[in-house]
């Protein structure tokens, strides 16, 4: 038995996780660069 609502929900969740992870990496990189420049 397979139901699309679980795949839709899980794909949406994982995309949000990936975006959050990417943003955290970018912001973390910028912060480190700022500290380094000081």
């Amino acid at each position: 038995h397979s139901d699309g609502i679980f795949t839709d929900s899980y794909s949406r969740y994982r995309k949000q996780m990936a975006v959050k992870k990417y943003l955290a990496a970018v912001l973390g990189k910028r912060y480190k660069q700022r500290v380094k420049n000081k």
Partner: antibody, heavy 117, light 113 residues
Framework: QQLEQSGGGAEGGLVKPGGSLELCCKA??????????MCWVRQAPGKGLEWIGC????????DYASWVNGQFTLSRDIDQSTGCLQLNSLTVADTAMYYC??????WGPGTLVTVSS | AQVLTQTPSSVSAAVGGTVTINCQSS????????LSWFQQKPGQPPKGLIA???TLASGVPSRFKGSGSGTQFTLTISGVQCDDAAAYYC?????????????FGGGTEVVVK
Amino acid sequence: QQLEQSGGGAEGGLVKPGGSLELCCKASGFSLSSTYWMCWVRQAPGKGLEWIGCIYTGSGSTDYASWVNGQFTLSRDIDQSTGCLQLNSLTVADTAMYYCTKNFDLWGPGTLVTVSS
Amino acid sequence: AQVLTQTPSSVSAAVGGTVTINCQSSPSVYSNNYLSWFQQKPGQPPKGLIADASTLASGVPSRFKGSGSGTQFTLTISGVQCDDAAAYYCLGYYDCGSTDCHAFGGGTEVVVK
């Protein structure tokens, strides 16, 4: 669409404490280009469900439950449409039915792992 | 790590009665609504009933209803049938960056008289 599980065995894969075992899950009926998260869940006899971890079939990115602590490893073979769970340093407490699931949507029938001396 | 506390652990209901299962999460599930409910019968893998706290899977009878948000969730079975005798589990999706991605509730055994 279905998930076929191998390793261990529906009738019971018997492993000695300290031993290792690889469980695999083959997806069939999917588009070869489709990517998804293959997750693994276990259930000790008479107990509840316990999340182990997930692997993304596209990039191979993984997430594990904190209790796994390096004891188990997830891998995938895109060409074979297969995801595997390597179980190491097994103890009696790892005796359980191990399920693979695609996005918590489609589930494999489970494979029983029995750890006993 | 996060904890999903499911209550009660077992419940008995007469045919036609109502069953309420609670799932309390600490911390909140991601986006306040990423919680699913599963039904499991002996010797079978779990079957998805409800996703996103309240969205019913296709083929699941309308007597099953999911509600709640954030930390408190409920699965209600109205007009219980013999076929509903099973174990029920909630599954939370969390912020993987700060904790485990997922956790299951301890389960609730539903006995139908």
